[in-house]
């Protein structure tokens, strides 16, 4: 560290040879004592700092700040200034040192450029070749060729300073291929290096002004501005900022060259412009110059000053965004600030995170939408100085065209008996919910097939007309149509009912949901037959593994012969477009079965009993009946569906919660098997038993805590069971606040 | 609106001298090069002389080097052509100009008639 | 120097017509080339800067292409306004030199 004098006024380093000029002869020793009143240094020509092994720098063994500077058997190249220095100032003392070698007149500079001099045709401008000497009283000369011509001094615009080298006017060499100095002693001539003359250029290829897209600041911050030219070879080039407040100081622009790859066919310069710093005055566009003589070129950037540092949300930020299911949906931050905050996203109060589906940051980004990224997004901005934060909520919907539930389950082949009433039902469920549901009919005779593949459990028909079912006329009687709401696994869905008064003739219905983002549609083939009638025992749809049966019973004084059988595969359609009407033509290939034989006061009733039931049982039933009189087949169709076990699986994860006393918990836990499983809570590992605080509902499902107490904050456990196992979902309610004590207590 | 403004032309003797000026308003003047370029009656256009923002870099024509001179007063927005030394064939219309990528601004021409 | 070699010297042409004028330079100067316009007692008008850059406000009719030593001026449709003499000039090397000129008269 320096250490001064104190109560000592700075004085100059003082050097042990009180003259500026110093001459000595090659191979002598040149020795040199610098004494100051701080820590000192020496440079030396060349500008080698301590980095040359013939030089030695030693500390004096009399004083604390002195330091001797000795050469050994000095050369010509030596010649130059030694500078004696503070290290922390400017304060200096020099003595300029002559070695002087009459062998080598001229010494090598580090600014030589390895030989290069640059001139311009500026008439005025003189140029300096430096051709240095280690003895100040040469007579030297300037030679140019080709061709060739000698220049001497002529005490006016041509001169030699052993210091510099020799100085001309640029004009004058111009034409030159190259130069060196020369000089005469004692009837011999001594040469300098040769200097290879290169006329400057002057095309501009291109000036950038960085940063480029504009700079923000607050008052009082510093401004720093590059503004880079990009030039050919040989270019010297005036640089010139233009801004209003720039007329006034204080600014500070350094311009320098910048060192480029060797070989490089361009030179670059730099222009720095510096504000220490600013005040709003100095808002505006800033316009950087480049000039070379025949080429100008500009660039400019734009600098916005700041009262202070702050963060806002700019106008357009979006509150709701609706989007359809599939959609990419781009959700901008439109933020004011400076600095530029950071920026986080929240769903339902957890922080986001980007995947592969899903990108935060100035953007919100949803490459496709699907329901569950329907929620209340939360963006915060935070100034990264201040940390003021500033939030925004962002109502995402994602819209869902309308879905009709039983399209893929039910069967479109199965009969209705004839006189009976029968209700057709649509589940719909859209986001919107559906504006409209409407019901439309046509005769079963009055449509075609449709051929699609894709038809096949869905909407094996097409018709020409559909007519609404209010015009009946034909038809079955109807006797209404209503739509409820209804929450179905966990959905708010829309069942819309269609009830036929009495089946009197085959017919297709369809139902029609509209929402905004789309319609779906179902249709229902309602086959009506006068011949025996299917139930399935117990009625619910069977598991694999259960005991089902398949009943089919007819009136014994009308029919006989009651028959079993399965539908073979290849009379099932391949194509929807082969899908028979009516149902009992063309069954093809049909595998009987066995069958039990009941009878009641009026009925006979044939049963096919499946005691285990597998998912090879699945398929088309067919009751067949004979007419007693006509011995006309009558036949009815059945679709058995068996449900494949599965062991229960959490489908919705329960979430933590932080809670504050007296409010109310409400969580579900949402769980899938088959069959389906019993629902147990737990708390801490103790399972839970309803009391006026904790209710249990939905068979157990939910669980809701009302009134909430501190007690009440621990791990809570949803146990989902079935023969097959059971599955277990966790979350921990947090209980904040201090709990108040009742009179009760 | 960008404009250069000429002035200083006239008849001169051969030997004689003669200080083209050039006035700049519309734009920063002190950013651009500038130029000069002539043109003898009936002829083709001759390159003359350049002078960069600062004056630092400064080019002639081989057939005026030495004789003229341009200089510039950036504090005054002007360019000035000094002809010494004039010759029959410098008589023609001088031009100032403005340069950037090209010679995108002209100024107006002023004729310079050398002639005993 | 660079040698600037216009053709042709001279054109006729009537409104409406497709003109083409060319530069030839003595050895090659990239695509630093440059094509201005002058009326009689005016002065020139820059119109195509690095042989094919359109200056502000020039009609698009004016184009430039071409590069080495080889380029061409094209009008597409001439118009009244159109009759003038054409130079090119090289910015290659120092010094600049302009071509020669080309003088567009009527028909």
């Known amino acids: 560290a320096s250490v001064g004098l104190p109560g000592v006024s700075l004085e100059s380093p003082t050097l042990s040879t009180q003259k500026d000029i110093l001459t000595i002869m090659a191979n002598s020793t040149l020795q040199i004592t610098c004494r100051g009143q701080r820590e000192l240094d020496w440079l030396w020509p060349n500008h080698q700092s301590g980095s040359e092994e013939r030089v030695e720098v030693t500390e004096c063994s009399d004083d604390l700040f002195c330091k001797t500077l000795t050469i050994a058997k000095v050369i010509a190249n030596d010649t130059g200034a030694y500078k004696c220095f503070y290290q922390d100032t400017n304060m200096a003392s020099v003595v300029y040192v002559y070695v002087q070698d009459y062998r080598s007149p001229f010494i090598a500079s580090v600014s030589d450029q390895h030989g290069v001099v640059f001139i311009t045709e500026n008439k005025n401008k003189t140029m300096v070749i430096p051709c240095l000497g280690s003895t100040s009283n040469l007579n030297v000369s300037l030679c140019a060729r080709y061709p060739e011509k000698r220049f001497v001094p002529d005490g006016d615009k041509i001169s030699w300073d052993s210091k510099k080298g020799f100085s001309i006017p640029s004009y004058m060499i111009s034409y030159a291929g190259m130069v060196f100095c020369e000089a005469k002693i004692h009837d011999e001539t001594y040469q300098s290096i040769m200097y290879i003359v290169v006329v400057v250029g002057y095309r501009i290829y291109d000036v950038l002004v960085s940063p480029p897209h504009g700079v923000e600041l607050s008052v009082g911050q510093k401004l720093v501005l590059n503004c880079t030219a990009r030039t050919e070879l040989n270019v010297g080039l005036d640089f010139n900022w233009e801004h209003p407040s720039l007329k006034h100081p204080p600014k500070k622009v350094v311009n320098r060259e910048l060192k480029t790859q060797p070989g490089s066919e361009m030179k670059k310069f730099l222009s720095t412009l510096t504000i220490e710093s600013v005040t709003r005055a100095d808002q505006g566009w800033y316009i950087c110059a480049a000039s070379s003589g025949l080429m100008t070129k500009r660039n400019s950037t734009f600098v916005r000053v700041h009262e202070k540092p702050f963060v806002a949300f700019g106008s357009g930020m979006e509150s709701l965004v609706e989007a359809a299911v599939g959609a990419r949906i781009r959700v901008p931050v439109r933020w004011l600030g400076y600095p530029p905050p950071e920026i986080k996203w929240y769903k339902n109060g957890r922080l986001l995170e980007s995947n592969h589906t899903i990108k935060v940051g100035h953007v919100l980004t949803i490459s496709e939408a699907s329901e569950k990224d329907t929620g209340n997004y939360t963006v915060i901005l935070t100034n990264p100085i201040t940390r003021e934060k500033q939030s925004h909520v962002v109502s995402l919907v994602v819209n869902v065209p309308p879905q009709i539930g039983e399209k893929s389950l039910i069967s479109p082949v199965d009969s209705y008996q004839y006189g009976s009433s029968q209700t057709l039902t649509c589940t719909v469920y859209a986001v919107p919910p559906p504006h409209h549901i409407r019901w439309y009919w046509q005769l079963e005779e009055e449509c075609s097939e449709q051929a699609s593949q894709s038809a096949l459990m869905t909407n094996p028909y097409t018709c020409k007309e559909w007519r609404n079912v209010e015009d009946f006329q034909g038809g079955n009687r109807i006797e209404g149509s209503k739509n409820q709401f209804a929450l179905i696994e966990g959905k708010n869905k829309t069942v819309s009912t269609l009830v036929i008064q009495a089946a009197n003739v085959s017919a297709l219905y369809k139902c029609e949901a509209v929402n905004s983002v789309g319609r779906g549609e179902r249709i229902i083939s309602f086959h009506v037959t006068r011949g025996p009638e299917i139930t399935l025992h117990p009625s619910t749809q069977p598991t694999e593994q259960e005991t089902v049966s398949l009943w089919c019973s007819a009136d014994r004084t009308t029919f006989e012969n009651l028959t079993w059988c399965k539908l073979g595969p290849q009379a099932l359609p391949v194509h929807a477009g082969e899908l028979p009407v009516p149902v009992c033509e063309n069954l093809g290939a049909l595998a009987r079965l066995n069958a039990t034989v009941f009878s009641n006061s009026t009925n006979d009733i044939l049963i096919t009993e499946f005691q285990n039931a597998s998912l090879q049982d699945q398929g088309h039933y067919v009751c067949f009946a004979q007419d007693k009189k006509t011995k006309k087949r009558h036949c009815v169709v059945r679709q058995l569906v068996v449900l494949e076990r599965m062991a229960p699986v959490i489908t919705g994860s329960l979430e933590n919660q932080t809670t504050s006393i007296g409010e109310t918990i409400e969580v579900s836990c949402m769980a899938s098997g088959n069959p389906p499983p019993q629902f147990t809570w737990f708390k801490d590992n103790e399972m839970l038993v309803e009391d006026s605080g904790i209710i249990l509902k939905a068979g157990n499902q939910n669980l809701t805590i009302r009134r909430v107490r501190k007690e009440d904050e621990g791990l809570y456990t949803c146990q989902a069971c079935s023969v097959l196992g059971c599955v277990r979902a966790e979350a921990f309610f947090i209980v904040e606040g201090a709990q108040e004590k009742t009179n009760l207590e | 609106e960008v404009q250069l403004v000429q002035s200083g032309g006239g008849l001169v003797k051969p030997g004689g001298s003669l200080r083209l000026s050039c006035a700049a308003s519309g734009f920063t003047f002190s950013s651009y090069s500038m130029l000069w370029v002539r043109q003898a009656p009936g002829k083709g256009l001759e390159w003359v002389s350049a002078i960069s923002s600062s004056s630092s870099y400064i080019y002639y024509a081989d057939s005026v080097k030495g004789r003229f001179t341009i200089s510039r007063d950036n504090a005054k927005n002007s360019l000035y052509l000094q002809m010494n030394s004039l010759r029959a064939e410098d008589t023609a219309v001088y031009y100032c100009?403005?340069?950037?990528?090209?010679?995108?601004?002209w100024g107006q021409g002023t004729l310079v008639t050398v002639s005993s | 120097d660079i040698q600037m070699t216009q053709s042709p010297s001279s054109v006729s042409a009537s409104v409406g017509d497709r003109v083409t004028i060319t530069c030839r330079a003595s050895?090659?100067?990239?695509?630093?080339l440059t094509w201005y316009q002058q009326k009689p007692g005016k002065a020139p008008k820059l119109l195509i800067y690095e042989a094919s850059s359109l200056q502000s406000g020039v009609p698009s009719r004016f184009s430039g292409s071409g590069s080495g030593t080889d380029f061409t001026l094209t009008i597409s449709s001439l118009q009244p306004e159109d009759f003038a003499t054409y130079y090119c000039?090289?910015?290659?090397?120092?010094?600049?030199?302009f071509g020669g000129g080309t003088k567009v008269d009527i028909k």
């Open positions: 000039q090289q910015a290659k090397a120092f010094p600049p030199t």
């Open positions: 050895r090659g100067i990239d695509n630093w």
């Open positions: 100009a403005r340069v950037t990528d090209a010679f995108d601004i």
